[in-house]
């Protein structure tokens, strides 16, 4: 029954890029400007996504496919299909509701996005700090103190407890 009905439905013959126009005896009409239909048999065309402001156009809208956006430089995409744009920060910073803020001592961020994370605590693995951490880089752990030659010493500062900087509070 469904198959028979679809064969009799004139709208099923309307290809992508058109819509079945009820105002014109169900004739297949092209999608109006700034709209599209990605499948056949549609009774309306969808409005094209507009990429403006924080968004910029990655792919123009066509009669058969929606526009695709990415973010204006200085921001990066979040969410499926770049549904949001979020501010970039510098390495050594994290984004808060107050804007980009430097990582607290004992934490680092080596990217333009994301939160500051605590330096690795080398002593938990029985190792020593070979290279100190910075706001932009994690510590580099070296051999365990027992592996060092006699007389050599190494200090491993503990990673400080902290609240996650990405918290809105």
């Amino acid at each position: 029954f469904e198959r028979t009905r679809s064969l009799q439905d004139p709208c099923s013959n309307c290809p992508a890029g058109t819509f079945c126009d009820n105002n014109r005896n169900q004739i297949c009409s092209p999608c109006p400007p700034n709209s599209f239909s990605s499948a056949g048999g549609q009774r309306t065309c969808d409005i094209c996504r507009q990429c403006k402001g924080v968004f910029r156009t990655r792919k123009e809208c066509s009669s058969t496919s929606n526009a695709e956006c990415d973010c204006t430089p200085g921001f990066h995409c979040l969410g499926a299909g770049c549904s949001m744009c979020e501010q970039d920060c510098k390495q050594g910073q994290e984004l808060t509701k107050k804007g980009c803020k430097d990582c607290c001592f004992g934490t680092f961020n080596d990217q333009k996005r994301g939160i500051c994370r605590p330096w690795t605590n080398c002593s938990l693995d029985g190792k020593s700090v070979l290279v100190n951490g910075t706001k932009e880089r994690d510590v580099v752990c070296g051999p365990s103190p027992a592996d060092l030659s006699p007389g050599a010493s190494s200090v491993t500062p503990p990673a400080p407890a902290r609240e996650p900087g990405h918290s809105p509070q």
């Epitope: 979040l78 969410g79 949001m84 744009c85 509701k97 809105p168």
Partner: nanobody, 123 residues
Framework: EVQLVESGGGLVQPGGSLRLSCAAT?????NYWMNWVRQAPGKGLEW???????????YYVDSVKGRFTISRDNAKNSLYLQMNSLRAEDTAVYYC????????????????SGQGTTVTVSS
């Protein structure tokens, strides 16, 4: 349709003032954090200020602190940016932008913005 429309830009002399407005349609402004961002000629996009749903929290980029004031009138579905002591480096296209669902909790993403209004500071 969800839309933001900015207005109030123009040419102003250094030291002068301007008030930008942003009219929101298609959604209830009082449910969202709102932001102003700007793009100077040849530069990337820069966040300027934000304000929470009821206006009790407001934050600014360091370069505009003490000079710019963000405000909102939820009854009029409008956002504002009062800009005083304008400098040449404030020359930019200014956009109003809505914080997406969950803004300030697990992200700081902006999901809707307008076409922008141009501010030129020059003598």
């Amino acid at each position: 349709e969800v839309q933001l429309v900015e207005s109030g830009g123009g040419l102003v002399q250094p030291g002068g003032s301007l008030r930008l407005s942003c009219a929101a349609t298609g959604f209830t402004l009082s449910n969202y954090w709102m932001n102003w961002v700007r793009q100077a000629p040849g530069k990337g996009l820069e966040w300027v200020a934000n304000i929470n749903q009821d206006g009790s929290e407001r934050y600014y980029v360091d370069s505009v602190k003490g000079r710019f004031t963000i405000s909102r009138d939820n009854a009029k579905n409008s956002l504002y940016l009062q800009m005083n002591s304008l400098r040449a480096e404030d020359t930019a296209v200014y956009y109003c932008a809505r914080g997406g669902e969950g803004y300030g909790v697990d992200h700081y993403g902006l999901d809707v913005s307008g076409q922008g209004t141009t501010v030129t500071v020059s003598s």
